[in-house]
Amino acid sequence: DWVVAPISVPENGKGPFPQRLNQLKSNKDRDTKIFYSITGPGADSPPEGVFAVEKETGWLLLNKPLDREEIAKYELFGHAVSENGASVEDPMNISIIVTDQNDHKPKFTQDTFRGSVLEGVMPGTSVMQVTATDEDDAVNTYNGVVAYSIHSQEPKEPHDLMFTIHKSTGTISVISSGLDREKVPEYRLTVQATDMDGEGSTTTAEAVVQILDANDNAPEFDPQKYEAHVPENAVGHEVQRLTVTDLDAPNSPAWRATYLIMGGDDGDHFTITTHPESNQGILTTRKGLDFEAKNQHTLYVEVTNEAPFVLKLPTSTATIVVHVEDVNEAPVFVPPSKVVEVQEGIPTGEPVCVYTAEDPDKENQKISYRILRDPAGWLAMDPDSGQVTAVGTLDREDEQFVRNNIYEVMVLAMDNGSPPTTGTGTLLLTLIDVNDHGPVPEPRQITICNQSPVRQVLNITDKDLSPHTSPFQAQLTDDSDIYWTAEVNEEGDTVVLSLKKFLKQDTYDVHLSLSDHGNKEQLTVIRATVCDCHGHVETCPGPWKGG
């Protein structure tokens, strides 16, 4: 029959070539001479000429060694034609199967594989996987079937069989207990991949297993007892650096220390932080310590890690004896800010108040006083008694120095300690108003027509406070009332000035006396420009020169 069973050809054949494979034969050759040919990849299309057929004999030839890893199967067509070129058979499938030879060693996908596992894990824990490939056939033969094994382990501690590898998957697992990062931080395994399912060619690679840190070591104080000296009152002062050792991986949460003051700090005077590089506990004062109240503190500090312990571990404790050192403390004014009411304009030499300071120190130190800041120079202070007296006129209405009736003075107290220290106090003088200012009209110049004049409304101001202000009273003096009238409005805070007789165009002085509710009188001269005009005017019309 015009059929060829699949032809198996081993790869890497040694020849000699051409090599006979099979004979194509049509039974039509009884009737006529048959010519044979083949087509397909490997025959008349790339890779061309690998296979050929003798036209008259039908012998199929192989012209070169085959490589299964390049082409594993060739699918050709055989043709049979008569002498006149007519096809005598349908094209026949010719399958050439390239059978595998074990001509490739396994190859690891990496020279070095890296994996990691936590120290102290149980046997059976998976670590990593190594992979090797083999180009040979692993389906129909064992040529490409890779078996993995561990050839060696370095270091061989605690013994040489800490790991195992799955023969077929390459998964490396822990086989023994005793992984301890602090003793062996890294293992180097020489792994083997062997084809023929472990019976053939071998290749090696390195598997580096990093042992990851677990918090299986507690930090320990070294030393456990400390003595420190701290000046009183110092806030944020470094008292002591506490040193710990921890065998776990530096700069990891299992190594980084967490400090806690367990006792001895009832007043919450201290705080402890961890230094980010050295891991030391930095004990500092949260508040100032008071030598006079307590001159020694005994603190108990416990250390743990940022990460929890993976097993029950004893906690290390340190004892710190803090000796508080006496310092010369500054006098403190009582109160720190003193408010005193005083009448403005009191006579020079009149006492204002006594403002004194207390010294926190136990010794009876002498305190002397002086004024530190007195912007207007109105006050003096007795250095011994702290008596404050007026040496200038206190003026409530002085806008340069007085704000909201308050005059602010800073005073200084100095003790006679060694070295001397100073404290300051603030004296706030609330100045009580006296009727020392009369009412004043605004504006003090007016322009008015001499015919149908418009009434001029003047505002009245008084620097004093109520009740030394409105209602005001107005009165014209020095014959000004002949030509003018002045009336205070109902509210009593404006005065209306009216021209009651004709005056020729000129400038006139109007003498206006205003008095406040406390009868403080103030005489003001109003300059009135009279113009030849009717009604309202801003400036006199025409070329006119005031006399």
């Epitope: 051409p18 010519f35 050929a52 003798e54 008259e56």
Partner: antibody, heavy 118, light 107 residues
């Protein structure tokens, strides 16, 4: 009838070159592998070169590899052997022979003599 | 390379007599062996291929056989044209190698 006829033999000095030809007739030349075989003066036969039917692949023994080149022109039904760096031991009768039934050497020519001598 | 040891190198026999020529292969070549004959004028012809298959036009007095690594050409009844040179060639291993030849002479 399959016929092959060699030509191109002659006398050549050592280190010289020579090209032999083999004209084929009476069969489909392009579908058969072809070879050169030589017979030394002591009557020993030695395979020299083979070329696949399509001319894609060539084969040589170590004794001539790198010095001899076999080629073919299927359009002209002609086989060639280019010989260079000739040695006295290359002196022989050179035959061209065809594969037949997928094996050597089904049909032989009459041969052409090559003499390498100074 | 594979060596073909042909024996005898020469053989005298009478017309009508039967003779056998032998080639021994130094390695396994399977059935990949042919026998050739060379006429006095240098003409070479293949007689047998694949150890025992007769080429077309070859008389039936010629036959080939194998016993292990020994390959034989047998001429059952010698005729006058048979007194020529005979060679074996193996094509089971590369390179192709010939036997040294046997010269068959008339007694």
């Amino acid at each position: 009838v399959q016929l092959v006829e060699e030509s191109g033999g002659g006398l050549v000095k050592p280190g010289g070159s020579l090209k032999l030809s083999c004209a084929a007739s009476g069969f489909t030349f392009s579908s058969y592998a072809m070879s050169w075989v030589r017979q030394t003066p002591d009557k020993r036969l030695e395979w020299v070169a083979t070329i696949s039917s399509g001319g894609h692949y060539t084969y040589y023994p170590d004794s001539v590899k790198g010095r001899f080149t076999i080629s073919r022109d299927n359009a002209k039904n002609t086989l060639y052997l280019q010989m260079s760096s000739l040695k006295s031991e290359d002196t022989a009768m050179y035959y061209c022979a065809s594969y037949y039934y997928g094996i050597p050497f089904g049909y032989w020519g009459q041969g052409t003599t090559v003499t390498v001598s100074s | 390379e594979l060596v073909m040891t042909q024996s005898p190198s020469s053989l005298s026999a009478s017309l009508g007599e039967g003779v056998s020529l032998t080639c021994r292969a130094s390695q396994d070549i399977g059935i990949n062996l042919i026998w050739l004959r060379q006429e006095p004028d240098g003409t070479i012809k293949r007689l047998i291929y694949d150890t025992s298959s007769l080429d077309s036009g070859v008389p039936k007095r010629f036959s080939g056989s194998r016993s292990g690594s020994d390959y034989s050409l047998t001429i059952s009844s010698l005729e006058s044209e048979d007194f020529v040179h005979y060679y074996c060639l193996q094509y089971g291993s590369s390179p192709l190698t010939f036997g040294a030849g046997t010269k068959l002479e008339i007694k």
